[in-house]
């Protein structure tokens, strides 16, 4: 195709006449705004086809694109066409009129678009503004096309000055439909409710502006529909929430609630489900076992823990020997009940630096208007053993006795042992265990007493040695669950002048 004048851009005078010619090897035609204006078509003797477009009495409205194309390109291998852009500077025409379609620009993704405000004069300075603001936006301008760039979801106008007159274009509206892959989250105010209470569920989608929510729920299957409410969360762009509210729940409302969300722009969808349980009345249930006998060590801190589930939230009280316990101001006792999940609770009693007086019968009671549960245990305070006395005596009978006295809780065990070879025992040789069954001629007598006020056992053990022929190191060891204590004494024969 050959076009004369070749362009690609021409500036013509207003009111003038201008002739455009296009020729080619097949029939050709001039097009303007997707239409064919009146033109003269001819075929020369050499087989060349031509079309002549005469533009008369030009005005600014003749500004724009002109195309020459093959009249019937079906038989041609190339869909060739030539473009020419003509400006007709005309002070009476500000911005060229737009089709309505050009004023409303719709997007579903971030992409470059053109705001097609065009003027008749390529020398004019054109600026782009948000409709609300005066500041010119730094967007490149092409006199043949307009402003091209990535635009926010805003309304825009173009401005230019013709002579001393400022001219505004129509407003252009950019609508961006926010779409992305769908990620649904569903939650309930409560997943357990009593009959007669309300069920309220929320389904939230982020990052999408246009979605459809569809709920499926037990009541729907029986044909009893509930109308959900959809709203847009304030201060959170593109957070859409659908709320399903079922007042006065029935037992039959127990089951799976599913929120299905679809977005038709890119055909995305996602769904999430949640289980709701409607109970006839409230409940309190203990979880796990707590032994009826619990232990704490004297002067150490001890936390006693009870795990239970309940609905509705219960009141929790602790008692010691039938007297109500509370957080002590001295910080010796701390009570706490915490919600570890919607219906699961952990109640803890912490005794700080346990004292003997804190032994006793403890009860935790959890209750509400529908149900109650209680759990009791005995708390025993364990006291490490102490050897309080180890003494040796020589009764007239000729035998020698060693007396060991100690205390502790639980009841201490007593172990007697001896070392004959004082140089090597107990480092190199183990001590010999003593008692009624040992090879020495010795007898053992042990008495145990429980002291109620101190809540501990006292052990008194007497070792009788029949004859001692050389110095002997006698050791008394007391042991219980929380410790051991040892003392030793040297026993010498009667014949020796010293002890």
């Amino acid at each position: 195709l050959v076009v004369t004048p070749p362009g690609p851009e021409l500036v013509l005078n207003v009111s003038s006449t201008f002739v455009l010619t296009c020729s080619g090897s097949a029939p050709v035609v001039w097009e303007r705004m997707s239409q064919e204006p009146p033109q003269e078509m001819a075929k020369a003797q050499d087989g060349t086809f031509s079309s002549v477009l005469t533009l008369t009495n030009l005005t600014g409205l003749d500004t724009g694109e002109y195309f020459c194309t093959h009249n019937d390109s079906r038989g041609l291998e190339t869909d060739e066409r030539k473009r020419l852009y003509i400006f007709v500077p005309d002070p009476t025409v500000g911005f060229l009129p737009n089709d309505a379609e050009e004023l409303f620009i719709f997007l579903t993704e971030i992409t470059e678009i053109t705001i097609p405000c065009r003027v008749t004069d390529p020398q004019l300075v054109v600026t782009l503004h948000e409709k609300k603001g005066d500041v010119a936006l730094p967007v490149p301008y092409d006199h043949q096309r307009g402003f091209s760039g990535i635009f926010e979801d805003r309304s825009y106008i173009c401005k230019t000055t013709i002579g001393d007159r400022e001219v505004d274009s129509d407003a252009y509206y950019v609508y961006r439909l926010q779409v992305s892959s769908i990620n649904v989250s569903v939650n309930a105010v409560q997943t357990v409710v009593r009959q007669g209470e309300n069920i309220t569920l929320m389904c939230i989608v982020i990052g999408n502006e246009v979605v459809n929510f569809e709920w499926t729920y037990p009541r729907k299957e029986s044909g009893r529909l509930v109308e959900p409410v959809t709203d847009f969360l304030l201060d959170m762009p593109y957070h859409i929430r659908s709320i399903l509210h079922i007042p006065s729940a029935e037992l039959e409302d127990s089951g799976t609630y599913t929120c299905n969300v679809t977005e038709s722009v890119n055909d995305h969808q996602d769904e999430k489900a949640i289980n709701i349980t409607v109970v006839e009345s409230g409940y309190v249930r203990l979880l796990g076992e707590v032994g009826t006998l619990q232990f704490a060590e004297l002067h150490r801190s001890r936390t006693l823990q009870v795990v239970f589930e309940a609905y509705p939230p219960p009141t929790v009280l602790w008692f010691k020997d039938n007297r109500t316990l509370g957080d002590s101001s001295a910080g010796e006792i701390a009570l706490s009940t915490r919600n570890v999940s919607e219906t699961r609770y952990v109640s803890e009693l912490t005794l700080v630096r346990v004292k003997v007086a804190e032994a006793g019968h403890y009860t935790m009671r959890a209750f509400h208007e529908d149900a109650e549960v209680q759990l009791s245990f005995q708390l025993q305070i364990n006291v490490p053993v102490r050897v309080l006395e180890l003494s040796e005596s020589h009764p007239d009978s000729g035998e020698q006795t060693v007396r060991c006295r100690g205390r502790g809780m639980p009841q201490p065990n007593i172990i007697w042992s001896a070392c004959r070879d004082l140089k090597r025992c107990p480092r190199e040789l183990p001590p010999t265990l003593l008692g009624n069954s040992s090879e020495e001629e010795s007898q053992l007598e042990t008495n145990v007493t429980y002291w109620e006020e101190e809540q501990e056992f006292e052990v008194v053990s007497t070792l009788r040695l029949q004859h001692v022929d050389r110095p002997l190191s006698v050791r008394c060891t007391l042991r219980n669950a929380v410790g051991q204590d040892t003392q030793e004494v040297i026993v010498v024969p009667h014949s020796l002048p010293f002890k």
Epitope: K132, D153, R154, S155, Y173, Y175, R176, L177
Partner: nanobody, 116 residues
Framework: QVQLVQSGAEVKKPGASVKVSCKAS????????MSWVRQAPGQGLEWMGW????????KYAQKFQDRVTLTTDTSTSTAYLELRSLRSDDTAVYYC?????????WGQGTLVTVSS
């Protein structure tokens, strides 16, 4: 908050008409115009027309000029799209959208299925 709530899905026979509503809340209805856009399966968004809620002035895309009527009811803050002489290629999701100047707001879409 601005919210546009559209009427439910419609199934129509070829040659029939459909009227889709779009109820606005959260802003002064007459202060903004309402655009209508549609998206046919597998296609992009196609602008159909715009109506000024203030004075009822309309702009239509040339393609729909003869078959579309846009109206508003300011007493209920509702905009309507009526499409006549339905054809199977009118099967699409129809959206209303308004522009608040600093961002646009969209209805949730209404699926119109045209099938014999």
């Amino acid at each position: 908050q601005v919210q546009l709530v559209q009427s439910g899905a419609e199934v129509k026979k070829p040659g029939a008409s459909v009227k889709v509503s779009c109820k606005a809340s959260g802003y002064t209805f007459i202060s903004h115009g309402m655009s209508w856009v549609r998206q046919a399966p597998g296609q992009g968004l196609e602008w159909m027309g715009w109506i000024s809620a203030d004075n009822g002035n309309t702009k239509y895309a040339q393609k729909f000029q003869d078959r579309v009527t846009l109206t508003t009811d300011t007493s209920t803050s509702t905009a309507y799209l009526e499409l006549r002489s339905l054809r199977s290629d009118d099967t699409a999701v129809y959206y209303c959208a308004t522009h608040g100047g600093d961002r646009s707001y969209w209805g949730q879409g209404t699926l119109v299925t045209v099938s014999s």
